[in-house]
Interface confidence: low
């Protein structure tokens, strides 16, 4: 399987909500011993490998934001810890995997990585990640709502989390 980032850049005004999204596609094994571990973290564009460094999102580590499930099952973080920080990660039946960040501040700007790990019998590891940039802006040049720029050279799109 692979991970696609629908948008490579999100530009948002302060105070807005945004949902960053990755999509898992390709063959997904639905065997009883296969599970998926999905999570989000902040990182930097390393010289060697983007997403190799794992930093917390609003003080929550990638362990705090994880989801577990088999195949393309739906799941979401419901624990208070994430919600208290204005965060929620979710996964749907179609392979979409997202994190919603509420009430954005300038401190939320940076590189975000989604990580998907296929676990077979506890250990065999197939992992892929996607990266996207979030720019939170303030002042007269800030957009009125979030604008997402697709990973390919398509037109930008206005997006705002509910």
């Amino acid at each position: 399987f692979k991970v696609a980032t629908l948008y490579s850049l999100y530009v948002c005004p302060e105070g807005q909500n945004v949902t960053l999204t990755c999509r898992v596609f390709g063959p997904v094994d639905k065997g009883h011993d296969v599970t998926f571990y999905k999570t989000w973290y902040r990182s930097s564009r390393g010289e060697v490998q983007t997403c190799s460094e794992r930093r917390p999102i609003r003080n929550l580590t990638f362990q705090d934001l994880h989801l577990h499930h088999g195949g393309h099952q739906a799941a979401n973080t419901s624990h208070d810890l994430a919600q208290r920080h204005g965060l929620e990660s979710a996964s749907d039946h179609h392979g979409n995997f997202s994190i919603t960040m509420r009430n954005l501040t300038l401190l939320d700007s940076g590189l975000y990585c989604c990580l998907v790990v296929e676990i077979r019998h506890h250990h065999s590891e197939h992992r892929v990640h996607g990266a996207m940039e979030l720019q939170v802006q303030t002042g007269k040049d800030a957009p009125s709502s979030c604008v997402a720029y697709p990973s390919s050279s398509q037109e930008s799109e206005n997006i705002t989390a509910a």
Epitope: Q63, H66, H122, E125
Partner: antibody
Framework: EVQLQQSGPELEKPGASVKISCKAS????????MNWVKQNNGKSLEWIGN????????TYNQKFKGKATLTVDKSSSTAYMQLKSLTSEDSAVYYC?????????????WGAGTTVTVSS | DVVMTQTPLSLPVSLGDQASISCRSS???????????LHWYLQKPGQSPKLLIY???NRFSGVPDRFSGSGSGTDFTLKISRVEAEDLGVYFC?????????FGGGTKLEIK
């Protein structure tokens, strides 16, 4: 702060069983496997096995199958290890340790250890 | 089981010296996914082990850059470029490529 708090020292008679606990705090308990490691005489380390706290899946070192049983209580974020049919060979310090990267076998947080002494 | 052999058993050093610890495995630690799961821990007297290096050469968060790991296949090395007093203790290598995970016998770093 991420912490693993282990239960206190145990003195047991040969043939008895003991159950030691490891209470996790400061992180999402189901986000990483919990491992158990035995240390004899302050020197060698032996991996006993691990448990995925989300599913309860266990993987054991063959050497400890039948000796150790790993369980978790998700509601209290606590992992347990029961050792049965104790002999003097089981006298050691036992550590719980969190797998840093979910299930890849390197441990970033360790408990302080529980000393088990088996003596008649 | 994979046997991990560490040398030397004891390593007397002077503060400021470089120290080098070797770890050999009885079989290759290259996983079928291409990763090599060889890790290093330091255990100070009366404490639990602490992760220093994971997957051969990745320094864990907060570990000083005087620690470095290298190697491949079955042959691995931990180097400390300038030994400080806080580095003293027992160093263990560990593999998690194969189940059961196994540890080396330890190398005690002590003052000469």
């Amino acid at each position: 702060e991420v912490q693993l708090q282990q239960s206190g020292p145990e003195l047991e008679k040969p043939g008895a069983s003991v159950k030691i606990s490891c209470k996790a705090s400061g992180y999402s308990f189901t986000g990483s496997n919990m491992n158990w490691v035995k240390q004899n005489n302050g020197k060698s380390l032996e991996w006993i096995g691990n448990i995925d706290p989300y599913y309860g899946y266990t993987t054991y070192n063959q050497k400890f199958k039948g000796k150790a049983t790993l369980t978790v209580d998700k509601s209290s974020s606590t992992a347990y290890m029961q050792l049965k049919s104790l002999t003097s060979e089981d006298s050691a310090v036992y550590y719980c340790a969190r797998d840093y990267d979910y299930a890849l076998g390197y441990f970033d947080v360790w408990g302080a250890g529980t000393t088990v002494t088996v003596s008649s | 089981d994979v046997v991990m052999t560490q040398t030397p058993l004891s390593l007397p050093v002077s503060l400021g010296d470089q120290a080098s610890i070797s770890c050999r495995s009885s079989q290759s630690l290259v996983h079928s996914n291409g990763n090599t799961y060889l890790h290093w821990y330091l255990q100070k007297p009366g404490q639990s082990p602490k992760l220093l290096i994971y997957k051969v050469s990745n320094r864990f968060s907060g570990v000083p850059d005087r620690f470095s790991g290298s190697g491949s296949g079955t042959d691995f090395t931990l180097k400390i470029s300038r030994v400080e007093a806080e580095d003293l203790g027992v160093y263990f290598c560990s593999q998690s490529t194969h189940v059961p995970y196994t540890f080396g016998g330890g190398t005690k770093l002590e003052i000469k």
